[in-house]
């Protein structure tokens, strides 16, 4: 797809003897305007054959009213350049007419008074993408100046308008059988699509490269009219290509609107209406297939079922975003509870609790003390940011609510034997050893190195552990 | 100076069919970008288009009676020919025709000389 | 179908009196048309491709608008003014008429 411009410099009476009348006068004040017609190939120009490539209509120019006497200027222009979208290939060659209309401005019954003042036509081989052309035609006595250029509209490139490329979006490939875009080596072409030439009213096509017909078209291109030799007998007046009076196909029978695209005619033509994520004369280009790797973050993508999507990409967790493309905020919904650090480490969630607290997301709260009872007597003891809990002798655990073995520990040092007792453990000390937990060497002269022992226990008496 | 004027049948019957010319001048049909049209305007009520016809034979109706009309032209005698079938007393009403200009592909630009109409009655 | 919808459907107004018509369509069209009918005529083109004057329509005619809401305005009434007015659009098969807006002389 691309868009024909054309620049008209300027319109009046050419070179040599003979110069035209104004077309203008003070009794009759008019404007002008230009129309172009476009014609792949190089066809012939007969006005009465269609516009395939397209047409287009200037503004109205200026009011002009002649001076009397004077000759016939330069005639004042419109503003702003013509321009002819063309939505299949820019053909290289192509023939045009430049038609100078009048509008006559005076106080006539009925409408607008058109009459044509100069028709130009020619054949000309361009580029698409190229610089401006300039051409000079003559028409009778009148010359017309202009410049003339074709122009690829995104996602379209090449001299054909052919080569469709998409950012890409991989930053090392493009897709599958895909080459990057010269000179915009950061886009990936994109597959083609309808035959080229394949006729915009006539034809459409599903694959890419096919030409499929409208009931009542036949042909490669889909230009050659079915013959209308099975209508019965034709009545009243009839041109060279109506035989009959069976109305013909119209352009939205057999609807040439592809996914889902509504048709409805226009007054020469038709018009679809693509749902989201198509585009095209026929919504036939999706904006962005599977094939452009559009998944962001390592999403899969798949081929959307729902008509509206031509894709879908199924995100890994951490992203979302009908792309992928947003990283998702996880901390933003402060699953760390208790005034805990949220950190998103992308693979997993982690949460940094503050003093007191624990679990996954800070939700155990460890130093309160406030209605949390220690089993079995035991008492809870609040400090150094952790709750616990003083266990009666017997007890252990968090809660004390386990059965303690006291001599599991092996708690008696020095080969010291150890029972466990009702009221907790008793050490009986190797010879040599003495304390509670066979703790202090006896001395050789037979004092020992703490202060005598409690009144009732000899040295080497088993030493109960209060 | 462009004229364009209706005639046919002012009285039909239902069931019938009406065929209507509209024989213009000061233009022709052979010119790039001119078209026919025809619209009616049943008595007291809006107007309705019901068809037209471009200088290259593109032709529209519209959808509601596209299986009862039919657009035609002789472009050597400049003359458009609508014909509808199986008329219905509802298809009172005057018949006009128009001239249509389009300059540019799909744009029509004005609607801008009309024929003076033909009062057609469907009655048994 | 694209409907358009004229209003009002009726008014009254004075020679001199500015008058605006409006013309809105259910769905987006690119140009609008105006016509001017009196009883027993046929109906005359005044505005074509929205804004511009039909020829021979004076000057105290005029038409804007864009997208759905169009507008025809008549700056100074004057006698031969009083008639029935139709937008029309374009854009899509069927190229339907508004429903009409009869002024009349109050």
């Known amino acids: 797809a691309g868009v024909f411009e054309l620049q008209i410099h300027s319109f009046g009476p050419g070179p040599g003897p003979g110069a035209p009348r104004s077309p203008c006068s003070a009794r009759l004040p008019c404007r002008l305007f230009f129309r172009v017609c476009l014609k792949p190939g190089l066809s012939e120009e007969a006005a009465e054959s269609p516009c395939a490539l397209g047409a287009a209509l200037s503004a109205r120019g200026p009011v002009y009213t002649e001076q009397p006497g004077a000759p016939a200027p330069d005639l004042p222009l419109p503003d702003g350049l013509l321009q002819v979208p063309f939505r299949d290939a820019w053909p290289g060659t192509f023939s045009f007419i430049i038609e100078t209309w009048r509008e006559e401005l005076g106080d006539q019954i009925g409408g607008p008074a058109w009459s044509l003042l100069a028709r130009v036509a020619g054949r000309r081989r361009l580029a698409a993408g190229g610089p401006w052309a300039r051409d000079i035609q003559r028409a009778g006595a009148w010359e017309l100046r202009f410049s003339y250029r074709a122009r690829c509209e995104p996602p379209a490139v090449g001299t054909a308008c052919t080569r469709l490329c998409r950012p890409r979006s991989a930053p090392s490939r493009c897709g599958p059988g895909l080459r990057p875009c010269a000179p915009l080596e950061d886009e990936c072409e994109a597959p083609l699509v309808c035959r080229a030439g394949c006729s915009p009213e006539h034809g459409f096509c599903e694959q890419p490269g096919e030409c499929r017909c409208l009931e009542g078209w036949t042909g490669p291109l889909c230009t050659v009219p079915v013959s209308t030799s099975s209508c019965l007998s034709p009545r009243g007046p009839s041109s060279a290509t109506t035989g009959c009076l069976v109305p013909g196909p119209g352009p939205c029978d057999g609807n040439p609107c592809a996914n889902g695209g509504s048709c409805s005619e226009t007054p020469r033509s038709f018009e679809c209406t693509c749902p989201r994520g198509f585009y095209g004369l026929r919504c036939e280009v999706s904006g962005v297939t599977c094939a452009d790797g559009p998944c962001f973050n390592g999403g899969l993508c798949v081929g959307g079922a729902d008509p509206d999507s031509a894709y879908i990409c199924h995100c890994p967790p951490g992203f979302q975003g009908s792309n992928c493309e947003k990283r998702v905020d996880r901390c933003s919904l402060q699953p760390c509870r208790n005034g805990g650090l949220c950190l998103d480490l992308g693979h997993a969630l982690r949460c940094r609790c503050r003093a007191g607290f624990a679990g996954p997301r800070c939700e155990h709260d460890l130093d309160d003390c406030a209605g949390r009872a220690c089993a079995n007597g035991g008492t809870c003891v609040e400090g150094g940011g952790a709750h616990r809990c003083s266990c009666a002798l017997g007890f252990g655990g968090r809660d004390c609510r386990e059965r303690a073995d006291p001599c599991a520990a092996r708690p008696c040092a020095h080969g010291g034997r150890c029972y466990a007792h009702f009221s907790g453990l008793v050490c009986a000390c190797a010879p040599g050893y003495m304390g509670a937990r066979c703790e202090f060497p006896v001395h050789p002269d037979g004092a020992s190195a703490l202060p005598a022992a409690p009144p009732g226990l000899r040295p080497g008496d088993p030493q109960r552990y209060l | 100076q462009i004229t364009l004027k209706e005639s046919g049948p002012t009285l039909v019957k239902p069931t019938q069919t009406l065929t209507l010319t509209c024989t213009f001048s000061g233009f022709s049909l052979s010119t790039s970008g001119m078209g026919v049209g025809w619209i009616r305007q049943p008595p007291g009520k809006a107007l309705e288009w019901l068809a037209h016809?471009?200088?290259?034979?593109?032709?529209r109706y519209s959808p509601s009676l596209k299986s009862r009309l039919t657009i035609t032209k002789d472009t050597s005698k400049n003359q458009v020919v609508l014909t509808m079938t199986n008329m219905d007393p509802v298809d009172t009403a005057t018949y006009y025709c128009?001239?249509?200009?389009?300059?540019?592909?799909?744009?029509?630009?004005?609607?801008?000389?009309w024929g003076q109409g033909t009062l057609v009655t469907v009655s048994s | 179908d694209i409907q358009m919808t004229q209003s009002p459907s009726s008014l009254s107004a004075s020679v001199g009196d500015r008058v605006t018509i409006t013309c809105s369509a259910s769905?987006?069209?690119?140009?609008m048309y105006w016509y001017q009918q009196k009883p027993g005529k046929a109906p005359k083109l005044l505005i074509y491709l929205t804004s511009n004057l039909a020829s021979g329509v004076p000057s105290r005619f005029s038409g804007s608008g864009s997208g759905t809401d169009f507008t025809l305005t008549i700056s100074s009434l004057q006698p031969e003014d009083f008639a029935t007015y139709y937008c029309q659009q374009w854009r899509s098969n069927p190229f339907t008429f508004g429903q009409g807006t009869k002024l009349e002389i109050k």
């Open positions: 016809i471009w200088w290259d034979d593109v032709k």
């Open positions: 128009a001239r249509i200009v389009s300059f540019d592909n799909d744009v029509v630009s004005a609607m801008d000389y």
């Open positions: 769905s987006s069209v690119s140009h």
